[in-house]
Interface confidence: medium
């Protein structure tokens, strides 16, 4: 009987791999090249193990593959002889989370690698400003997130806790609304949503500017600047100017940084400056009329940030109009 000196015994290695819901992932596994390669990928839960993908005698063996992995897994068959036993995994679902073991046997060694797969999702959140009757609300909303995120609010850079949370999706992914009543406040607010698994953070910032009092037929300049602290130079973003009226928002202008295209929905609206440096998105509204009074909202949004700037414009009758009456 031979001594085991011909064999290499490798302890079980463990790796954590993070994937995104609906996307593809590679579960890594490598081994020392040898003849007669056998590969068994298995999924282990508390009660059972399930065959994910097997390879032996020169080809993939899927007869005993669990149905949940059908048409979703493959090996890099051309690279097996070079020691690559990695598993290509398609269309991740949250149910795929868990422990995977890759058994690799060759004529010179047998090893078991352990891969812990975690699946996350973080659809870009948004910050909305809503008026309901006489009340004003800020809503931070994320349509699809997993695992549960950490949501924090700040008022004038001071953390606050009084917010109303609504969550749907019992097992995930979750849809979450966090609402803050800001009626009568002139403070600035910030909402941060953090997905610790995906190491992704989104921040929404709301600022109310001082009220602007203008006379009829004058023009008004509404400031809105991109703060460099928030946006990196190569990041795509969009700018939307809208007007809030009776709780309904109507779009006045729209700008996309990727195409550098602007669409105006109001002929009296124009940029204050040329958008050469793409940081100042202040607007001019000309030929003001009494009906232009109201709240104007500038929304600058990227995957990581939303900056909301609110202007309240009061348009008063001009002297001539007043004396004519």
């Amino acid at each position: 009987i031979f001594l085991s000196a011909f064999f290499t015994y490798v302890p079980m290695n463990e790796q954590i791999i993070i994937g995104r819901l609906g996307e593809d992932i590679i579960l890594p596994s490598s081994f020392e090249r040898g003849s007669e390669v056998v590969i068994h990928w298995k999924y282990q839960d508390s009660y059972n193990s399930y065959n994910v993908h097997s390879y032996y005698k020169g080809s993939g063996r899927l007869e005993s593959q669990d149905t949940r992995y059908a048409n979703r897994t493959s090996l890099f068959y051309n690279e097996i002889q070079n020691g690559n036993a990695s598993l290509f995994f398609r269309r991740l679902s949250l149910l795929d989370e868990g422990i995977y073991t890759c058994y690799v046997g060759t004529a010179i060694q047998a090893i078991t690698n352990k891969v812990v797969l975690k699946v996350g999702v973080f659809l870009t959140p948004m910050m909305k400003y809503e008026k309901r009757n006489t009340n004003s609300f800020l809503i931070c909303n994320v349509l699809s997130v997993y695992p549960r995120p950490i949501i924090t609010w700040k008022m004038d850079n001071t953390p606050i806790s009084e917010n109303n949370m609504q969550e749907t999706g019992s097992l995930g992914p979750f849809s979450i609304n966090s609402t803050l009543n800001i009626t009568g406040s002139n403070s600035s607010y910030e909402c941060t949503i953090e997905n610790s698994l995906l190491k992704q953070t989104w921040t929404g910032r709301w600022t109310m500017k001082d009220g602007l009092h203008k006379m009829q037929s004058e023009h008004v300049s509404l400031s809105c600047e991109l703060v460099n602290d928030y946006f990196s130079p190569n990041q795509d973003f969009k700018v939307t100017w809208s007007r809030m009226e009776s709780g309904i928002s109507s779009i006045l202008a729209y700008y996309l940084s990727s195409s550098q295209n602007t669409t105006f929905y109001e002929s009296r609206f124009s940029w204050n400056k040329e958008l050469k440096n793409q940081s100042d998105f202040s607007m001019n509204l000309t030929d003001l009329s009494l009906s232009d009074s109201g709240e104007y909202l500038c929304n600058i949004s990227s995957d990581e940030y939303t900056l909301l700037t609110i202007h309240t414009v009061h348009v008063e009758p001009s002297q001539e109009t007043a004396s004519d009456n």
């Epitope: 015994y9 068994h40 005698k57 046997g105």
Partner: antibody
């Protein structure tokens, strides 16, 4: 050094049961498929059963199917063969053997064997 | 089930002779064939797998060839310590049948 030590053999009457054990050491037991192979003294080798490294797959020779059950306890580094409804023709030396690779069914290490005698 | 046959069932040869043992499968088994050596009173020992791959530590005078249904084990120069019974085994699918064996001794 790879060591496989069988136990549990003995004399038993036809129709009765016996359980063989095989204690493994000197290698990572949970990484390898394991076999039982038997040999009537002075005769050839007969493959009996195999179990995968994690116990998830098992195969048997037609001559023992439905009567013998192969199992393993990886926490104890032990392989078992439960033999029910024993017949006179089951008399043999039973070897516990280790796969060279799990899923490629040939053997690179053998135990010394344990003799099972089925006789009335 | 696939049957395995070996020929001859026994042979005697002189030290230094070239010895050839044949193993035949009743159906094709690709190269999924192993050869074992069992010396008197000892347990079997793996010599060759995948029809022609020499197991670690096995002397180079042993070699294997063949594919499909016909396979051979060759001892290029028979040595006294090679006195044994040699078995082939197919391992493409269960049952993993052994051949009946070929007994080799010295003249």
């Amino acid at each position: 050094q790879v060591q496989l030590v069988e136990s549990g053999g003995g004399v038993v009457q036809p129709g009765r049961s016996l359980r063989l054990s095989c204690a493994a050491s000197g290698f990572t037991f949970s990484n390898y498929g394991m076999h039982w192979v038997r040999q009537v003294p002075g005769k050839g080798l007969e493959w009996v059963a195999v179990i995968w490294y994690d116990g998830s797959e098992k195969d048997y020779a037609d001559s023992v199917k439905g009567r013998f059950t192969i199992s393993r306890d990886n926490s104890k580094n032990t392989l078992y063969l439960q033999m029910n409804s024993l017949r006179v023709e089951d008399t043999a030396v039973y070897y516990c053997a280790k796969d060279l690779i799990s899923g490629i069914y040939y053997v690179d290490h053998w135990g010394q064997g344990t003799l099972v005698t089925v006789s009335s | 089930d696939i049957q395995m046959t070996q020929s001859p069932s026994s042979l005697s040869a002189s030290v230094g002779d070239r010895v050839t043992i044949t193993c035949r499968a009743s159906q094709g088994i690709s190269n999924y064939l192993a050869w074992y050596q069992q010396k008197p009173g000892k347990v079997p020992k793996l010599l060759i797998y995948a029809a022609s791959t020499l197991q670690s530590g096995v002397p180079s005078r042993f070699s294997g060839s063949g594919s499909g249904t016909d396979f051979t084990l060759t001892i290029s120069s028979l040595q006294p310590e090679d006195v044994a019974t040699y078995y082939c085994q197919k391992y493409n699918s269960a049952p993993f049948t052994f051949g009946p064996g070929t007994k080799v001794d010295i003249k």
